[in-house]
């Protein structure tokens, strides 16, 4: 009779993570008598996957009933496959021996490859806010995928970005892989509502890429522009001065009025108005009793925005000249200057 052969008909098997792998093996003869064992890998370090004779292998089931006398099908199923299960599996026939069974013949091996989906991309922005015209870096990470081939793209508001660097780790063999990418984004004043998107495409996703997003509202700081103006006279000897704080983001803002360098009032932006681009406007006013001042008054609107160094604008009230006419005329503007004179 022809010598027993162990046949593993599949050179390779490709299985998605979480699914069941079927590893096929048949023997061409019932002789010699002895059990079958399955191993992952070859040589002295091989890992026992299934032993027909003894042991507990909760993830492994046999395709046919190995207790039947004439059975020659030794195929197995391995459940809940993970990337860590990848490798070459050998079906090995043992001959009954005393005291131990003796390895008789091995199949040619079946390489199990596992397809695993990448994790949802995680996008991280800079730790500190940055102002328009600055370049900031965003990182995108995804883990646990197999095979290694993967495509990563960056978008800002739907427009693909080109300034980024991507690495897949490791560069050689592994049961699964990780991807890391860093993109550079130039901020503009209109970016409060902008989004940065990292898109990952992989064979396991069947054309439906995974996306991670970051809102630039968490990254950008738009500093305010200040304008100090004098309003028409409200009552005799009283002047209303306003400080327009425009186009700032985020909302955290504190304003201090100074009269000749002395703090007059401090307030925190509360009832702001929102612009279409997501920035905010706010106005503060100060009522100045001109008659209480002998000399010219220097009014300063000082704004501290989002913990940054204060910015300020000043306005000069002339109170010494022509006091009798004070309040009768509107302010004369010097174009390009924030000085206002009362005659």
């Amino acid at each position: 009779e022809e010598e027993l052969q162990v046949i593993q008909p599949d050179k390779s098997v490709l299985v998605a993570a979480g699914e069941t792998a079927t590893l096929r093996c048949t023997a061409t003869s019932l002789i010699p008598v002895g059990p079958i064992q399955w191993f992952r890998g070859a040589g002295p370090g091989r890992e026992l996957i299934y032993n027909q004779k003894e042991g507990h292998f909760p993830r492994v089931t046999t395709v046919s009933d190995l207790t039947k006398r004439n059975n020659m099908d030794f195929s197995i199923r391995i459940g809940n496959i993970t990337p860590a299960d990848a490798g070459t599996y050998y079906c090995v026939k043992f001959r009954k021996g005393s005291p131990d069974d003796v390895e008789f013949k091995s199949g040619a091996g079946t390489e199990l490859s596992v397809r695993a989906k990448p994790s949802a991309p995680v996008v991280s922005g800079p730790a500190a806010r940055a102002t328009p015209q600055h370049t900031v870096s965003f990182t995108c990470e995804s883990h646990g995928f197999s095979p290694r081939d993967i495509t990563l793209k960056w978008f800002k508001n739907g427009n693909e970005l080109s300034d980024f660097q991507t690495n897949v780790d490791p560069v050689g063999e592994s049961v699964s892989y990780s991807i890391h990418s860093t993109a550079k984004v130039v901020l503009t004043r209109e970016d409060v509502h902008s989004q940065v998107i990292c898109e990952v495409a992989h064979v396991t996703l069947q054309g439906d890429p995974l996306r991670g997003t970051a809102n630039l509202s968490e990254t950008i700081r738009v500093p305010p522009t200040l304008e100090v103006t004098q309003q028409p006279v409200r009552a005799e000897n009283q002047v209303n001065v306003t400080c327009q704080v425009r186009k700032f983001y985020p909302q955290r803002l504190q304003l201090t009025w100074l009269e000749n360098g002395n703090v007059s009032r401090t307030e925190t932006a509360s009832t702001v108005t929102e612009n279409k681009d997501g920035t905010y406007n706010w106005m503060s006013w100060l009522l100045v009793n001109v008659s209480a001042h002998r000399d010219d008054v220097k009014l300063t609107c000082q704004v501290e925005h989002d913990g940054q160094p204060a910015v300020s604008k000043s306005h000069d009230l002339k109170v010494s000249a022509h006091p009798k006419e004070q309040g009768s005329n509107t302010a004369a503007e010097n174009t390009g200057s924030n000085e206002r004179n009362i005659y």
């Epitope: 991280s124 990470e141 646990g144 690495n167 560069v171 990780s178 860093t182």
Partner: antibody, heavy 121, light 113 residues
């Protein structure tokens, strides 16, 4: 400056578990993967695995997949490794070491001083 | 897994001498896309933790004296110390970071005569 401060030596009984810590300072904790390496007395180095502190993702040397559990706490910038079902084979010094995952995948550039684990009944 | 083999396992040299040690990998560590070799060298002095000397097979880590030089490509790598100092007494390990699991060589112990 960069520092990886590891917890002190431990004596444990066979079958028990131990959890060691690695406190990172002097750099952005989430910008580096934290690797763990085993060194048995008078022996060479053996890579256990790593954790990405920013996502919590872990990757193990298959040899240690049932032995070591890696975790990280971003708020305290500390990485942890728990070893379970201890045997005499687990008696070793365990190092944490950081690795830049940025524009280039470098090797492990800073190492902790190591935590010595002795397993004895 | 990639097997890393170092030789010799130990060597004794006098201060001022040049020393070379070898590291071989069971498969190439050269990544064709960026032409980099994913190999590092570490120095471990008695009672201390390992210290990175060389990465990318030949790039010296900042602060490492220029008497340490890494060379080689593919599967054969060398660490050279041009003029040994007494403070170089240590075990030197090579490590591949080309594939997971990362693997180390068995080390070369440098002793001073």
């Amino acid at each position: 400056q960069v520092q990886l401060q590891q917890s002190g030596a431990e004596l444990a009984k066979p079958g028990a578990s131990v959890k060691m810590s690695c406190k990172a300072s002097g750099y952005t904790f989430t910008s580096y993967w934290m690797h763990w390496v085993k060194q048995r007395p008078g022996q060479g180095l053996e890579w256990i695995g790593y954790i990405d502190p920013s996502t919590g993702y872990t990757f193990h040397n298959q040899k240690f997949k049932d032995k070591a559990t890696l975790t990280a706490d971003k708020s305290s910038t500390t990485a942890y490794m728990q070893l379970r079902s201890l045997t005499s084979e687990d008696s070793a010094v365990y190092y944490c070491a950081r690795r830049d995952y940025g524009s280039s995948f470098y090797a492990m550039d800073y190492w902790g001083h190591g935590t010595s684990i002795t397993v004895s009944s | 897994d990639i097997v890393m083999s170092q030789s010799p396992s130990s060597l004794a040299v006098s201060v001022g001498e040049k020393v070379t040690m070898s590291c071989k990998s069971s498969q190439s560590l050269l990544y064709s896309t960026n032409q980099k070799n994913y190999l590092a060298w570490y120095q471990q002095k008695p009672g201390q933790s390992p210290k990175l000397l060389i990465y990318w097979a030949s790039t010296r880590e900042s602060g490492v004296p220029d008497r340490f030089t890494g060379s080689g490509s593919g599967t054969d790598f060398t660490l050279t110390i041009s003029s040994v100092k007494a403070e170089d007494l240590a075990v030197y390990y090579c490590q591949q970071y080309y594939s997971y699991p990362w693997t180390f060589g068995g080390g070369t112990k440098l002793e001073i005569k």
